[in-house]
Interface confidence: low
Amino acid sequence: LIIGFGISGRHSITVTTVASAGNIGEDGILSCTFEPDIKLSDIVIQWLKEGVLGLVHEFKEGKDELSEQDEMFRGRTAVFADQVIVGNASLRLKNVQLTDAGTYKCYIITSKGKGNANLEYKTGAFSMPEVNVDYNASSETLRCEAPRWFPQPTVVWASQVDQGANFSEVSNTSFELNSENVTMKVVSVLYNVTINNTYSCMIENDIAKATGDIKVTESEIKRRSHLQLLNSKAS
């Protein structure tokens, strides 16, 4: 969490941002809140990005003002206009690109004063893994697949019964580049699976951590997946 204040005493307002991550090709949110104002027409929101000449987005007098918007963001940004009056300056970024990563500044002007806070935005690709029994294999084998990751993640297998066991010798992980030549499909196979056990396939990079669980018994297979972003720190 980053909390920023304006520069001059009583003319400062608190602005709060939360570091976040964007999944390339999807829409992302850059979070920013501020002390609300009574009049929408008195609120100015400017989003800036370090190293970029133009603005990322500007909202003033109750509407978007995009004439100074940098070309790399054109057509891809929006604020939640109906929530600005309650202090929400968060920015929706459409079709997140790898190059959108960087330091952003949320700069706010209201009738109470000015304030700003920085936000670190990471971009990459992350997706939920799915773990299945691989019936094509000669022995009981688990297959963990996740369609889109970037940068290349690590994959670790764990088991409820054999806690702390190292499965690297009995697993094989491969990364297959997707058609857009950035993200990769992750496939990991675990051999020598025993029944009446729960296995976890954990995929992690510096942006996200995802886990796919599978419970294997003779009579049934139960699956569960979970995805967690790693850098959601408030500022």
Partner: antibody
Amino acid sequence: EVKLVESGGGLVQPGGSVRLSCATSGFTFSDYYMSWVRQPPGKALELLGFIRNKANGYTREYSASVKGRFTMSRDNSQSVLYLQMNTLRAEDSATYYCARDSHRTYFDYWGQGTTLTVSS
Amino acid sequence: QIVLSQSPAILSASPGEKVTMTCRASSSVSSMHWYQQKPGSSPKPWIYATSNLASGVPTRFSGSGSGTSYSLTISRVEAEDAATYYCQQWSSNPPMYTFGGGTKLEIK
């Protein structure tokens, strides 16, 4: 060095069609919005339309005066911008420029222009 | 769609004089760009984002303005400044670039 070079102008009969080209070099073509601007003899500049960059899906916008008659396209592998003009009229006679949109919504590089005359 | 009106259409000045040309928008805009065009040549970016001089533009040129009124000023006109100057802005709704009608600067 950024270069934009238009070609394809000349004399065309009313009702005819022509395709103008703008060959570019010196920059990553797919990263930029590209526009066509025309200027009739002795008159002001008029924007015909623009085609967005890769990040924005290469979508197009046209001015009302040419919508439906003119079509912009781009070959990103060859870094070439095109303007297909159909059902030409005498008032389409002009110098046609291609221009690159900078990162600040203005045109930082222009071609030398190609002259089109529509006359019988 | 925003309309840009430039005045005067023709401006005549002697070398050393200070001249100002204006560009008025039909509704408020937050920035204006200017181009210089000489006969037989393509337009050159001259001033961008209201007041920033493009590369190679002499410092005797300046730009200012806000809202619906913008101006280009030459502190001391020189013979090489004879040209037509066009203002231009970007509108996001609908998305389109718009040019003014131009101001032709003549040197006496």
